[in-house]
Interface confidence: low
């Protein structure tokens, strides 16, 4: 299947050229999304090319500056966010990256009423997390691990919490492992539908042992970098969660929400919170053996002014078969009655579906079924529910989006998208307004992508907000290489890969191949996406054929195939890459003498562990950040597939599934072995491992590090690391310079 | 800048009424409590009556069923209606803008409120 | 009600000296607590709230500490735009909300 744009052949063949390394450095060939920033039903907020930001009305067509690009830049102005009552602007600049998600900045407000920056009761700098209230302009803020509330921008700040310590207490905001590993987000606080509350997140690493690594700078002493990071079997993190009544905060001051018993009485995680009411609200549980979740509803109880958490709204998820959930337990979406609500679960086949659950989970009426998976509820309203699926054409790596019509009986379902562009669209996300009254679909590929705006009622695409023109008429003298996904059926499993072939493909040639793995749980590599990166230089201008294989252990094809890793990581993913290669070799078309294997992170270690199978089969690889030893790991993280790395749990497969274990395999394959020094999320100690243990068994290998740069090795290092491995490659694959 | 100017003070006689007023600019007095204090001359501060954003209102034990506190919002002013005067009731009465439902953050310069025969 | 009780009732202390005011309350307040700073003919100035946390505006040299029943308003050298009447007020319970008798710093 061919899912590039179809080009002109022969004539103009000459004219066009080959991709090179710096078109892809340079970003020469980069697309566009066009994602509104809603701010009603039919009103949103778009920053302009010149850096105005722009209000737009659909319905009046109309659109105007509420804040220029002056403004914006009389503080060095990075982002920007509207109060619910279009008062005030917050100007975010001095952006400072920490983790992931997390940053801090300068906050500058700045009142649209009299056009000036708010004066007097100034927001100390940096701060942490800063939200507007989603009703009026009230501010949260945090501000060195304390939680800071502003009834309004220029009055003095009420302190919520006081506890706070760097890396010992965190209050509304998660600590490395929280935000890395369970809620995926910068922040840890959440205010009520109309800001009536703000419930928040406390999480306690004074037990956590610290990971500790040099960060060399260009002092004459290194900085020592300490993080709270609880690796596998140790220490976890302590969490509790608050509520807080904002408009008369120290009345009773912040109440907590009592943890589920069955949850509590051993290890546990919050896993996220949702506001139901101003006077509702939901969190979800996790046990640290994650296998079972616990959904617990609690209610505002005026006369206590405290919450109250029924058992009788308690709602537990468990998998026998694996861990609850996918990467993370699903949310719900609550419906307009506040206690009903909609969820992504796993069906009695396997599947994750939507179920509604109205009283218990087990009396959830199943609303999706297949064997395909519902992988995302975007909105539900009074007659509508919408989602994403794999359903269409039985390709796991797209996405469509779907309505249902839930005001109806029996509800009807309707692809919104599977034909509005075939062939240049099977990969969406989308953006709803308020009330579904309009959406945005952002078009992914396998086409050039396309940001379009539609009518919710009718579903009319009503104009085109980006469609990258300027990309388009760039890529066309272009030599992009072609791209198939097809299927490989072994031992009744089924193995979807993504080829990448060079322009001038012939099958009766014989071509290098490089494996892009990835492969840990619940991921997908093989998707219906545009992307001009690395591997495509590499088969467009080099003549590699590139492929990418989802095995065992990915995301979107049923729990059969995603929990088969469950308590056995690094042996079913390697495997499956490898009976990959044998079925590409038997194609006819891949030269056996030169195949290599690359990974990143979690690809890093499969790619180490399949050079070191001992098949033969692969010539050379790279493993950039790989993990080593799950014992190094993330405790929330490794755990979940894991379990717990105890005698009495699975210390063997701990000590059975390291990199080192095997350094002996090494000898006969060419590995290069890549580590960014101050890596705080996959740590150093992985590569150094490897290092060490391939130098005691006296195995030659070349590696790189990178001083100073984390897990993305991003800026100039990037530059750097891609131009290496490229020579590496065609040193290993003898192709000239 | 946040600024409270109260007005309405007075010599009244013991029996009478008077109105206080108190104008705020600067900010929006309909989301925030409001509070009067009063302070007889030469002794320390009393908390008299306050109304909450909501509109719910408050008074000390001295002063209940005798003094309403009112508020109107277009016109950003607080209002303190005192009947049934009595001497006691002599005193520098304050508006201050209430913090959530805590402490007192902006004060007027106060009025003075005298009740003599 | 809760009563609060401020001691001395009068502080005489030179420029430049530390000044250590006392606020007791009849029972426990967490730390619901603010000070008030007060000079003749004028409105009161809100100094600390939560006990501890300083205003905006005022100077570092103003703290305060203290929780439960017992709490200090501690002034580190005294300026002389200090010697004032200073008021201590909880907002734990509430109506009313109570003020403590006042401690008056004077020039000795």
């Known amino acids: 299947i061919v899912l590039r744009p179809s080009r002109v052949h022969n004539s103009e063949e000459n004219t066009m050229r080959a991709l090179t390394l710096k078109d892809i450095l340079n970003g020469t060939f980069s697309y566009k999304t066009f994602f509104p920033n809603w701010i009603s039903g039919q009103e949103y907020l778009h920053q302009s090319a010149d850096n105005n930001i722009v209000l737009y009305n659909i319905e009046t067509g109309q659109s105007y500056t509420i804040l220029s690009n002056r403004t914006m830049k009389s503080v060095n102005a990075s982002n920007y966010g509207l109060s619910p009552d279009r008062q005030f602007v917050y100007l975010e600049s001095d952006y400072s990256k920490l983790w992931r998600y997390s940053y801090t900045a300068t906050y500058y407000i700045y009142d649209l009423s009299n056009g000036e920056f708010v004066r007097g009761n100034e927001l100390p700098r940096p701060i942490q997390y800063l939200c507007w209230s989603p009703v009026g302009s009230k501010l949260a803020y945090v501000y060195q691990n304390n939680i800071y509330l502003k009834q309004r921008p220029g009055d003095p700040p009420f302190q919520i919490t006081f506890n706070g310590r760097e890396n010992k207490i965190f209050n509304g905001i998660p600590d490395w492992v929280y935000e890395e590993e369970m809620l995926a987000t910068k922040y840890a606080l959440w205010w009520s539908p109309n800001g009536k509350f703000l419930a928040y997140a406390e999480f306690n690493d004074t037990d956590i042992p610290v990971i500790a690594y040099s960060y060399y700078g260009d002092e004459q002493y290194p900085r020592t970098i300490n993080i709270p990071y609880p690796k596998a079997g140790a220490k976890n993190p302590v969490v509790r969660i608050f509520i807080i009544d904002t408009t008369y905060p120290a009345y009773v001051g912040p109440q907590e929400v009592p943890v589920p018993a069955m949850i509590a009485s051993s290890d546990y995680y919050f896993s996220w919170l949702t506001w139901v009411t101003d006077e509702r609200v939901c969190l979800q549980w996790l046990k640290r053996v994650q296998n079972v979740s616990v959904l617990s509803i609690c209610d505002f109880r005026e006369d206590w002014q405290t919450w109250d958490c029924p058992k009788t709204q308690e709602h537990i998820e468990e998998s026998r078969t694996g861990w609850a959930g996918g990467f993370f337990v699903s949310t719900p979406v609550f419906s307009y009655d506040a206690i009903s609500y909609y969820k992504i679960f796993s069906d009695k086949d396997g599947y994750k579906h939507i179920h509604y659950i109205k009283d218990t989970v087990e009396n959830a009426i199943q609303i999706t079924s297949g064997k395909w998976e519902a992988i995302n509820i975007f909105r539900v309203t009074q007659d509508s529910l919408f989602y994403s699926s794999n359903e269409f054409e039985e390709y796991p790596g797209r996405r469509n989006i779907y309505r249902i019509s839930i005001g109806s009986y029996p509800p009807s379902k309707k692809c919104v998208t599977c034909h509005l562009r075939k062939e240049r669209c099977q990969y969406y996300t989308a953006s709803f307004s308020d009330y579904a009254k309009y959406y945005a679909l952002v078009c992914y590929g396998p086409g050039i992508p396309i940001s379009t705006l539609h009518d919710g009622r009718t579903d009319q695409e009503i104009k085109i907000l980006e469609e990258n023109k300027e990309l388009e008429n760039a890529l066309k003298n272009i030599q992009l290489p072609k791209e198939e996904i097809k299927k490989l059926e072994v031992d009744e499993i089924t193995l979807w890969y993504k080829m990448i072939l060079p322009p001038q493909f012939d099958r009766s040639k014989k071509y290098p191949l490089l494996i892009q793995v990835y492969g840990g749980p619940c991921s997908q590599s093989v998707r219906s996406v545009f992307a001009v990166n690395w591997i495509s230089y590499l088969a467009s201008k080099e003549g590699m054929v590139i492929a990418l294989v989802d095995g065992r252990g990915t995301a979107f094809q049923g729990d059969k195939l995603l929990y088969a890793v469950y308590r056995k990581l690094g042996v079913y993913e390697v495997e499956d890459q490898i009976t990959a290669v044998r079925k590409f070799i038997e194609m006819g078309f891949i030269d056996e003498k030169r195949i290599a294997i690359w990974g990143w992170s979690y690809g890093g270690y499969v790619s180490s562990l399949a050079l070191a199978s001992g098949t033969g089969l692969f010539k050379c690889g790279i493993a950039v950040a790989p993990v080593s030893s799950w014992e190094y790991y993330a405790s929330v993280y490794t755990e979940r597939f894991m379990g717990l790395p105890t005698k009495d749990d699975n210390l063997e497969h701990y000590k059975n599934s390291t990199v080192m274990a095997r350094a002996e395999y090494f000898r006969n394959v060419d590995y290069l072995l890549i580590h960014g020094t101050a890596d705080d999320n996959v740590h150093f100690q992985n590569s150094a491992q490897i290092a060490k243990a391939l130098v005691n068994a006296q195995v030659d290998f070349q590696a790189m590090w990178y001083s100073d740069q984390n897990h993305g090795l991003s800026g100039l290092s990037t530059n750097h690391l891609y131009t290496h491995m490229t020579h590496f490659l065609k040193q290993c694959f003898s192709l000239s310079d | 800048d946040v600024q409270l100017v109260e007005s309405g003070g007075g010599l009244v006689q013991p029996g009478g009424s008077l109105r206080l007023s108190c104008a705020a600019s600067g900010f929006s007095m309909s989301n925030f409590a409001m509070t009067w204090v009063r302070q007889a001359p030469g002794e320390g501060l009393e908390w008299v009556s306050g109304i909450r954003g909501s509109g719910t209102t408050y008074y000390a034990d001295s002063v209940k069923g005798r003094f309403t506190v009112s508020r109107d919002n277009s016109k950003n002013t607080l209002y303190l209606q005192m009947n049934s005067l009595r001497a006691e009731d002599t005193a520098i009465y304050y508006c201050a803008k209430t913090w959530g439902t805590e402490y007192f953050d902006y004060w007027g310069l106060g009025t003075l409120v005298t009740v003599s025969s | 009600e809760i009563v609060l009780t401020q001691s001395p009732g009068t502080l005489s202390l030179s420029p430049g000296e530390r000044a250590t005011l006392s606020c007791r309350a009849s029972?426990?307040?967490?730390?619901?607590l603010a000070w008030y700073q007060q000079k003749p003919g004028q409105a009161p100035r809100l100094l600390i709230f939560?006990?501890?946390n300083r205003a905006t505006g005022i100077p570092d040299r103003f703290s305060g500490s203290g929780s439960g029943t017992e709490f200090t308003l501690t002034i580190s050298s005294l300026e002389p735009e200090d010697f004032a009447v200073y008021y201590c007020?909880?907002?734990?319970?509430?109506?009313?909300?109570?003020f403590g008798g006042g401690t008056k710093v004077e020039i000795k």
């Open positions: 939560s006990a501890s």
């Open positions: 007020q909880q907002y734990y319970d509430w109506p009313p909300y109570t």
């Open positions: 029972q426990p307040i967490n730390n619901y």
